[in-house]
């Protein structure tokens, strides 16, 4: 950056080189150039000469004043007009930054995705700080009282192998930058209570043309957890409102769930599961589309990311890919 240049003087910022966004700031430039009594001192921001709010303090020093400075980053340098010099002489430069102290981190959540071997901790960091902000995740065993700290700039994955202090822990997050420091409240966890089962996936769907047409959704998970509760939500793609069905599930075999749906309508399905009675759910699975046939089956067009075809008495869709969707993700 501009801070690496050779200086013939000194540039400094008050109150500091990193300051709160919206503050009034002063940038001072002091020349120390051999055989030069500067006629004029100039300031440049991001290479553009500043023309206003410059005050000459004495023979070698000038001040540039900014009101309500709102730029997250700027490169400042100053120059001198020396007698007998054709060009301006560079005095010095400095990178300045403005931003905000961190908010109190909240919504601290730690989960163990089955088979991942990690505990993943996330939090809501609050408003954008604009400046380098680091987070320290504190994990303290309630059994041994031993505390471990993990430095990160966003979320953290902690190997479950490193959690040697039993099953119960306190977790909290400290956020710090040049403008302030905040800490979250403490989350108490039990490792057995935060496991999220291996992802549930909808593999295919078929509509059987019986007296009342019936759609069967086939779905599965590789989980080894015995007691799993799941929800499947579905709606016509033209609807806003989801219908939700709940299941107590044993994944020793592929699940088949039956739905009685309107004919000739494109539906979307998603599934999610949790260990029964525990706190955290999987995110909703990829969107799975299936178009129900007209009362007399006919070939239907390709559905988004799935193939739909005519198979005599059934119309089926199979999953051919994954489209992730978080648990707030509705489609219109």
């Amino acid at each position: 950056g501009i801070t690496n240049i050779n200086c013939s003087g000194h540039i400094w910022v008050e109150p500091a080189t990193i300051f709160k966004m919206g503050m009034n700031i002063s940038i001072y430039c002091q020349a120390a150039i051999k055989n030069c009594q500067p006629r004029k001192l100039h300031f440049y921001k991001n290479g553009i000469k500043e023309r206003f709010q410059i005050t000459r303090i004495n023979k070698t020093t000038a001040r540039l004043w900014y009101k309500n400075f709102l730029e997250p980053h700027a490169s400042m340098y100053c120059t001198a007009e020396c007698p007998k010099h054709f060009q301006e002489t560079l005095i010095c430069g400095k990178d300045i930054s403005s931003g905000y102290p961190p908010d109190i981190p909240d919504e601290v959540t730690c989960v163990i995705y089955e088979y991942s071997g990690n505990m993943t901790c996330t939090w809501n960091a609050g408003k954008l700080t604009y400046i380098d902000t680091k987070y320290v995740v504190h994990v303290k065993s309630l059994e041994t009282e031993e505390e471990q700290q993990y430095l990160t700039s966003s979320y953290i994955n902690i190997s479950t192998d490193s959690l040697q202090g039993g099953k119960k822990y306190l977790v909290w997050v400290q956020a710090a930058n040049a403008l302030g420091m905040e800490e979250s409240k403490q989350l108490q966890i039990h490792l057995d209570d935060i496991v999220i089962p291996s992802a549930a996936v909808i593999s295919r769907a078929e509509t059987i043309n019986a007296t009342v047409p019936k759609t069967i959704i086939y779905w599965d998970s590789q989980t080894t957890i015995e007691k799993v509760s799941c929800e499947m939500r579905y709606k016509a793609t033209t609807n806003q409102t989801w219908n939700v069905k709940e299941f107590d599930t044993n994944f020793t075999y592929v699940q088949q769930s039956e739905f009685y749906l309107e004919p000739n309508i494109k539906y979307v399905f998603q599934v999610r599961c949790q260990e029964t009675g525990k706190r955290y759910w999987q995110p909703w699975s990829s969107l799975f589309f299936h178009k129900t046939p007209e009362t007399v089956p006919q070939v239907t067009s390709k559905a988004f990311q799935h193939d739909t075809w005519n198979s005599g008495l059934t119309v089926a869709s199979i999953s051919t890919g994954h489209l992730t969707s978080d648990n707030r993700g509705d489609i219109g």
């Epitope: 909240d106 009282e145 909290w172 400290q174 302030g180 800490e183 409240k185 403490q186």
Partner: antibody, heavy 116, light 107 residues
């Protein structure tokens, strides 16, 4: 701007009770813990206890169990400490502060004088 | 409860001198120690957290060090405005506890 503003000085009689307040601004009181400290003249700081304003959960130092009762009113972002059965040993400056491990913001303190 | 012991109780130093304040914990507290400065008739102000992290706006003449049971606050070149009481405290476990304080006087 983050501030903790405490109620004014109190002169109370032995055996009486007093309720101190700590009104916060610049943050949501439910996002942090409020702690209370005692400081007698020319002495160190003593931690009284902590409240989680989000749910009212409290932790007290054993010495202050039964002496201090911590509450909050989240609608007004205010924390309270009730001190009961006051004796001369309760004469002190009481501070509220906020945080989990590190106390970066403090109230200005409330002086409680117990005298007949 | 964890007992925090500060020494000395008071000290008198000249401007420009190096000052070292000690704080000892009765058991291992990791780095869960903070230092506070309290000027006459004022509330305590956080100087150092996590044993060695300087809080925002604290002059760099203040340095914290140590872990486990022995902690030090160093003022590299004491200034007249550093006249104050200095407290150490632990946040390793409940109840939170503090040392008795060190009174720093300026000659």
């Amino acid at each position: 701007q983050i501030q903790l503003v405490q109620s004014g000085a109190e002169l109370v009689k032995p055996g009486a009770s007093v309720k101190l307040s700590c009104t916060t601004s610049g943050f949501n009181i439910k996002d942090t813990y409020i702690h209370w400290m005692k400081q007698r003249p020319e002495q160190g700081l003593e931690w009284i206890g902590r409240i989680d304003p989000a749910n009212g959960n409290t932790i007290y130092a054993s010495k202050f169990q039964g002496k201090a009762t911590l509450t909050t009113d989240t609608s007004s972002n205010t924390a309270y400490m009730l001190l009961s059965s006051l004796t001369s040993g309760d004469t002190a400056v009481y501070y509220c502060t906020r945080g989990t491990s590190w106390f970066a913001y403090w109230g200005q303190g409330t002086t409680v004088t117990v005298s007949s | 409860d964890i007992v925090m012991t500060q020494s000395p109780k008071s000290m008198s130093m000249s401007v420009g001198e190096r000052v070292t304040l000690s704080c000892k914990a009765s058991e291992n507290v990791g780095t869960s120690v903070s230092w506070f400065q309290q000027k006459p008739e004022q509330s305590p102000k956080l100087l150092i957290y996590g044993a060695s992290n300087r809080y925002t706006g604290v002059p760099d003449r203040f340095t914290g060090s140590g872990s486990a049971t022995d902690f030090t606050l160093t003022i590299s070149s004491v200034q007249a405005e550093d006249l104050a009481d200095y407290h150490c405290g632990q946040s390793y476990s409940y109840p939170r506890t503090f040392g008795g304080g060190t009174k720093l006087e300026i000659k």
